[in-house]
């Protein structure tokens, strides 16, 4: 789970803050439901997910409910409100649409069962940003070495559709990884802010896999990788002039 932890019990003491949790205040058995992840794909909505192993076993804790509170100006709201939408983000989840979401206030959420709190977290939306995967990956050949053994390619992609890049609401940085198809370890390139990057010195007789993921610059975490782009470089005659491939 990404974001700072907090205990709701002491929120009223410092209404404009996110309190750090005191580890001694509560214990959480691994069998109890726990938050696994909260994620905002585009800074305008977010969802939170939890485990629910207990309900598949013999011990029934009763229905799991999520409650949330937002920092209201001058005070945290004293009332906790129940999840506005248990359906849209899938099983064991709560979805907060754009009406409920602002990057300018902290949130606290708690899971309850039979009236008791079993897990709680606090965070601001920017801490949980994980963009959707980049889309529309493609590549073009840039250059082939005089020997015909190596080639350089340019890989291009597009930002996820729901990321408001044009207005600057999201500034994404991208990480490209590539490897030969039969290898297990991915080579990582340095993060970049553009949606294209050259990849140098690939072997022409090999097939490569390329993938890209993104994160919001300065906050949040990397999102899921794009679909894999397969790059097959055609065998070139070692006598072919380099100029032919510009």
């Amino acid at each position: 789970f990404s974001g700072s932890e907090a205990t709701a019990a002491i929120l009223s003491r410092a209404p404009w803050s996110l309190q750090s949790v005191n580890p001694g205040l509560k214990t959480n058995s691994s069998k109890e439901p726990k938050f696994t992840k909260c994620r905002s794909p585009e800074r305008e909505t977010f969802s939170c997910h939890w485990t629910d192993e207990v309900h598949h076993g013999t011990k029934n804790l009763g229905p799991i409910q999520l409650f949330y509170t937002r920092r209201n100006t001058q005070e945290w709201t004293q009332e906790w409100k129940e999840c506005p939408d248990y359906v849209s983000a899938g099983e064991n989840s709560c979805y907060f649409n754009s009406s409920f979401t602002s990057i300018w206030i902290p949130y606290c959420i708690k899971l309850t069962s039979n009236g008791g709190t079993v897990d709680e977290k606090c965070f601001s939306v920017d801490e949980i940003v994980q963009p959707d995967p980049p889309i529309a990956l493609n590549w073009t050949l840039l250059n082939v070495s005089l020997t015909g053994i190596h080639a350089d390619i340019q890989v291009r992609w597009e930002a996820p559709r729901n990321a408001d890049i044009q207005k600057g609401w999201m500034v994404l940085e991208y990480e490209l990884q590539y490897k030969e198809v039969n290898e297990t370890k991915w080579k990582m390139m340095d993060p970049i802010l553009t949606t294209s990057v050259p990849v140098y010195s690939l072997k022409v007789d090999k097939e490569y896999e390329v993938r890209v993921r993104s994160k919001q610059r300065n906050s949040g975490n990397y999102g899921e990788f794009s679909e894999v782009l397969y790059v097959t470089l055609p065998q070139m005659s070692q006598f072919t002039c380099e100029e032919d491939f510009y």
Epitope: S4, A14, W16, S17, T73, Q74, W104
Partner: antibody
């Protein structure tokens, strides 16, 4: 009682620098999200910058008009908020208010940028 | 950036009268993130109403707020002498925090 007292304002030439301070008391400063808001003479309010608590990684945010020129920072051991203003322009002339996440406001300090 | 437009720019009224101040946003703002401030000459702004309709502590109940979407209203049911001031709306929903240009309520 929440108290916020700004200092460091004054007259500065265009292109110059100034550092504003805000001494905070009456609340747990280290837990607080703090903002600077300014008001040009006879004009409305303009949000300038925000810095969050350590629990929120001291994340900082800036208005486009000051990005790259102003830096918001804090010293939790001294209960003090800062605004370092570089490459000042005449349009930065304003009263600068220190605010507790725009809930509680100091009385402000006047910054005049003029040659 | 969400732009907030306040109207009228100036409202000339007598004590005891009702004042209605308008704030219009260029795109929808959830009511949770819309506040009103009062500012008197030479003073810092003071939070008046938070989340569209909730009175901040110490604010008399002659002040009230309403609205949703792009249109919000601050109402002062009966103006007292101390209410003559400038009023600002403020949002912090989808863009960077922004303030309206202000409405000055002056004595007629």
């Amino acid at each position: 009682e929440v108290q916020l007292v700004e200092s460091g304002g004054g007259l500065v030439k265009p292109g110059g620098s100034l550092r504003l301070s805000c001494a905070a008391s009456g609340f747990t400063f280290s837990d607080a999200w703090m903002d600077w808001v300014r008001q040009a003479p006879g004009k409305g309010l303009e949000w300038v910058a925000e810095i969050r608590s350590k629990a929120n990684y001291h994340a900082t945010y800036y208005a486009e008009s000051v990005k790259g020129r102003f830096t918001i920072s804090r010293d939790d051991s001294k209960n003090t908020l800062y605004l370092q203003m570089n490459s000042l322009k005449t349009e930065d002339t304003a009263v600068y208010y220190c605010t507790l996440i725009r809930d509680y406001w100091g009385q402000g300090t006047l910054v005049t940028v003029s040659s | 950036e969400i732009v907030l437009t306040q109207s009228p720019g100036t409202l000339s009224l007598s004590p005891g009268e009702r004042a209605t101040l308008s704030c219009t946003a260029t795109s929808s703002v959830s009511s949770w993130y819309l506040h009103w401030y009062q500012q008197k000459p030479g003073q810092a702004p003071r939070l008046l109403i938070y989340s569209t309709s909730n009175l901040a502590s110490g604010i008399p109940d002659r002040f009230s707020g309403s609205g949703s979407g792009t249109d919000f209203t601050l109402t002062i049911s009966r103006l007292e002498p101390e209410d003559f001031a400038v009023y600002y709306c403020h949002q912090y929903h989808r863009s960077t925090p922004t303030f309206g240009g202000g409405t000055k309520v002056e004595i007629k």
